[in-house]
Amino acid sequence: RQQWELQGDRRCQSQLERANLRPCEQHLMQKIQRDEDSYGRDPYSPSQDPYSPSQDPDRRDPYSPSPYDRRGAGSSQHQERCCNELNEFENNQRCMCEALQQIMENQSDRLQGRQQEQQFKRELRNLPQQCGLRAPQRCDLEVESGGRDRY
């Protein structure tokens, strides 16, 4: 049994290394930012579209949304790519949990407010279900202070 677990851990580790979790992180952060903008913005102050991260078309990150995505279109595009990545973990609930933990760790230092952190965790827990996948039963998303700096 230990041998099986060890193989399972190795398999999970290689799955995690292969996976590109950036679309998941981008999708979730856009949701947080969107809510922040609609909550904290003066409704009478017109503004640039807050729904997609700022991008210079000539210097785009391959995982970033087009600067021309409107009203969250970029976010649904990210969600689709995110779901494709999470699908790889469908048959291993423990590994799915580790993927979610990695997403949390990668973004935790971006979340400087309690509400933002709680909302991110909530959205993250719901992510597998949004993708039509089984969510891990128990998955601790707590991160040690400060989180991991991943730029």
Epitope: L28, Q33, E36, S54, G113, G146, Y151
Partner: antibody, heavy 118, light 111 residues
């Protein structure tokens, strides 16, 4: 309305200590990271320190590391900056600043002036 | 540490005319989550700084739409489409990718 009121500044001799306070109101204080930012007379802005909403993470600029300590009392809606071994170059207006929860400094106090001189 | 460099350091402006301030960082401010951690602040004479733009292009609440932010990676720009007398002051860019660092400031004054 968000209000941040700093106090505790004054004239102090080099090597001595001073404790700054910031009284916050108009928002849920214990939900947000808070910062201290300073501005030397006629100079630009310099970020000094930050403390996470749950005090779980403290960050300092290299120029103050080991000398300054940031802390907060969520029950009192207060932010503090304990400044030890003060130097002439610490002379500045010290601002108490609220984070919007996503690393942006969205509200600033009026500042309290610290003058380090013999 | 990330170093922020603004140019010009002084900008004489004419009311009604456009103005532009550049900010460059010593390393990319584009996070893996797709956002550029670059904010713009204005400090009017005798006042505390106020937030203008967050995450490179998101205008803060109550900020007039003549202000706009753009750029990605290491190069960013703050544009004022038509300068008004009340826009004078010192403009600062600030990176929030790793801790927080400000540019030296750009003093905008009327010609």
């Amino acid at each position: 309305e968000v209000q941040l009121v700093e106090s505790g500044g004054g004239l102090v001799q080099p090597g001595r200590s001073l404790r700054l306070s910031c009284a916050a109101s108009g928002f849920t204080f214990d939900d947000y990271t808070m910062h201290w930012v300073r501005q030397a007379p006629g100079k630009g802005l310099e970020w000094v320190s930050s403390i996470r909403w749950n005090s779980g993470n403290l960050d300092y600029a290299d120029s103050v590391k080991g000398r300054f300590t940031i802390s907060r009392d969520n029950a009192r809606h207060s932010l503090y900056l304990q400044m030890n071994s003060l130097r002439a170059e610490d002379t500045a207006l010290y601002y108490c600043v609220k984070d919007n929860g996503l690393r942006t400094l969205d509200f600033w106090g009026q500042g309290t002036l610290v003058t380090v001189s013999s | 540490d990330i170093v922020m460099t603004q140019s010009p350091l002084s900008l004489p402006v004419t009311p009604g005319e456009p103005a532009s301030i550049s900010c460059r960082s010593s390393q990319s401010l584009l996070h893996r989550n797709g956002y550029n951690y670059l904010d713009w602040y204005l400090q009017k004479p005798g006042q505390s700084p106020q937030l203008l733009i967050s995450l490179a292009s998101n205008r803060a609440s109550g900020v007039p739409d003549r202000f706009s932010g753009s750029g990605s990676g290491t190069d960013f720009t703050l544009k004022i489409s038509r300068v008004e007398a009340e826009d004078v002051g010192v403009y600062y860019c600030m990176q929030a990718l790793q801790t927080w660092t400000f540019g030296q400031g750009t003093k905008v004054e009327l010609k």
